[in-house]
Interface confidence: medium
């Protein structure tokens, strides 16, 4: 009945772990919302306390810590689970309590099944490789503190449902997973499988991780302006529509924010009082390389608008580039009529 | 899916014109040059000329400058390619194919193709 | 304009083979990081299909068999090893310099 903050549901952290394999859960107060941690908590005399909900009930229940063998237990902030099951599956809390503070929050913890080929509805973390850039591993993700140092365990590796065995620019190097030269035919979900004993049982952790080749930074260049360019010019007529196209490459930037953007005399598009209209479309190469477009549209231009400068605007890491659209206004064709007057010398 | 679906074949008499259509779809029409490659009987490639959507810019390989007329309707995203004075030299499969976009600036190579239009031209 | 000249005309291989074919430029058509040279595949009564860009670029969707390599004038397109479909015309394209593109007069590769 006493106060006590309540984090709420924390769903930015759904947890996700495979069923009938070790789960190791800390408590995300510590992590996330708490600006000490467990150890210092500990020491002023507070207690962590655990529960769960389970999946489609209302009811906040405590966690059984007396099943056999231990399945479920604590040890200082972290929940263990020696192995999940699938109706483990619900909403966690953790909560940080003594008699005048407390505090606590609530975490999604979804238990999935894999079948023989490690496909499962878990949501996989994807791993960036340079193309054709050298040497590169990826690390058998979170399999820390599962067990001790002096425990030597077995690691497997496999591409999609294979073992990885005398593949030719991938080696396995037990945690790590060398490629020797990344190529486009290594994107694919790579799965290490931990084995590793425990007081006479043997436990498999299973991690799999989305492997993208992209675009490597040896190869990366500023921003290139395919359109406006020099060999296209925007010939209009008053009440004509005028529609510029400014499209883009971005070589793929580690961490780049890719920019495009019109300006009209030297102004945004937002900034002035023209009726114009830009939508913006998106697309990616193998190597995720990107190509943006941006259409500038004004329905029906006016003579003022056709001497107004149009100008492309990109940025990217490696640099910021500008293009301006050569508009102009048509000069309508001689009527007949006046070139014959010209013609007889009247004024 | 980027598809270019070109007009029936057709037959002609020498000094006629002949207008063929192409039809986009699967991508943003004005933003591409779209090309025309023609090839005679038994023959290699030949490149005709190129037309910019967004702005109806237009370039025609010399050999055909007077002959062609390349012309675009944004609203149906359809280019057309016509050839008038028409001799029996003009005989060919004539294709539209659109340019790519890389990382470099200009070069472009022909990355979709129609399925390509009969032109005969016989009297 | 800038002349493409490939050879030979014709080839014979078996399946299995590797097969070369060059082309080469009347003048460069490279600059600083790029080759505007292109190799295209057509079959009897179908639209040509590129398989190589900017000089070796492979394009989406074309067996690693294929490759091309070469700057400035002198370009190469490669079949590692020829396959049953591989059987057809080869041309190299440049587009150097808007707006004249040229294709070289097509090499075809048949079963011996």
């Known amino acids: 009945s006493e106060r006590c903050d309540d984090w709420g549901l924390d769903t930015m952290r759904q947890i996700q772990v495979f069923e009938d394999e070790p789960a190791r859960i800390k408590c995300p107060l510590f992590e996330h919302f708490l600006k000490f941690n467990y150890s210092t908590a500990h020491s002023a005399g507070l207690t962590l306390i655990w529960y769960w909900t389970r999946q489609d009930r209302d009811l906040e229940e405590p966690i059984n810590f007396r099943l056999p063998e231990n399945r479920i237990s604590k040890e200082k902030d972290v929940l263990w689970f020696r192995p999940t099951l699938l109706n483990d599956t619900g909403n966690y809390t953790c909560m940080l309590r003594n008699t005048t503070y407390c505090s606590k929050v609530a975490f999604p913890l979804e238990v999935v099944q894999k079948d023989s080929c490690f496909n499962s509805p878990m949501k996989l973390p994807v791993h960036k490789l340079y193309i054709e850039y050298g040497i590169q591993r990826i690390t058998c993700p979170n399999v820390d503190g599962y067990f001790p140092s002096s425990v030597k365990p077995t690691i497997t590796w496999y591409m999609g449902c294979y073992k990885i065995q005398n593949f030719n620019n991938v080696i396995p190097e037990g945690m790590n997973l060398s490629f020797l030269i990344a190529l486009i035919s290594n994107n694919g979900n790579y799965t290490c499988v931990v084995t590793y004993p425990e007081n006479g049982r043997t436990f498999h952790l299973t991690r799999t991780l989305t492997v993208k080749v992209v675009g490597s930074p040896k190869n990366a260049v500023p921003p290139v302006i395919h359109s406006p360019n020099d060999h296209v010019v925007y010939e209009k007529e008053p009440g004509e529509e005028l529609l510029i196209p400014c499209t883009v490459y971005f070589s793929f930037l580690m961490d780049s924010r890719n920019e495009v953007w019109w300006t009209i005399d030297g102004k945004k598009p937002d900034d002035i009082t023209i009726d114009v209209t830009i939508n913006e479309s998106i697309s990616h190469s193998r190597t995720e390389d990107e190509t943006r477009t941006q259409i500038l549209s004004i329905k029906k231009v006016t003579s003022e608008d056709l001497k107004r400068s149009y100008v492309c605007h990109a940025r990217s890491a490696k640099g910021e580039v500008a293009k301006a659209a050569k508009v102009k206004q048509k000069v309508p064709a001689p009527r007949y009529t006046v070139e014959l007057a010209c013609g007889f010398g009247a004024t | 899916q980027v598809q270019l679906v070109q007009s029936g074949a057709e037959v002609k008499k020498p000094g006629a014109s002949v207008k063929v259509s192409c039809k986009a779809s699967?991508?943003?029409?004005?933003?591409?040059?779209m090309n025309w490659v023609r090839q005679a009987p038994g023959q290699g490639l030949e490149w005709v000329g190129q037309i910019f959507p967004a702005s109806g810019t237009t370039y025609y390989a010399q050999k055909f400058q007077g002959r062609v007329t390349m012309t675009v309707d944004t609203s149906t995203s359809t280019v057309y390619m016509e050839l008038s004075s028409l001799r029996s030299e003009d005989t060919a499969v004539y294709y539209c194919?659109?340019?790519?976009?890389?990382?470099?600036?200009?070069?472009?190579?022909?990355?979709?193709w129609g399925q390509g239009t009969l032109v005969t031209v016989s009297s | 304009d800038i002349q493409l000249t490939q050879s030979p005309s014709s080839l014979s291989a078996s399946v299995g083979d590797r097969a070369t074919i060059t082309c080469r430029a009347s003048q460069s058509v490279s600059t600083s990081g790029y080759s505007s040279m292109h190799w295209y595949q057509q079959k009897p009564g179908k639209a040509p299909k590129l398989l190589i860009k900017y000089a070796s670029d492979l394009e989406s969707g074309v067996p690693s068999r294929f490759s091309g390599s070469g700057s400035g004038t002198d370009f190469t397109l490669t079949i590692s090893s020829v396959q049953p479909e591989d059987f057809a015309t080869y041309y190299c394209h440049h587009s150097w310099g808007i707006p004249m593109y040229t294709f070289g007069q097509g090499t075809k590769l048949e079963i011996k």
């Open positions: 699967g991508y943003i029409f004005i933003t591409y040059w």
């Open positions: 194919a659109r340019t790519d976009f890389y990382r470099y600036d200009g070069g472009y190579a022909l990355d979709y």
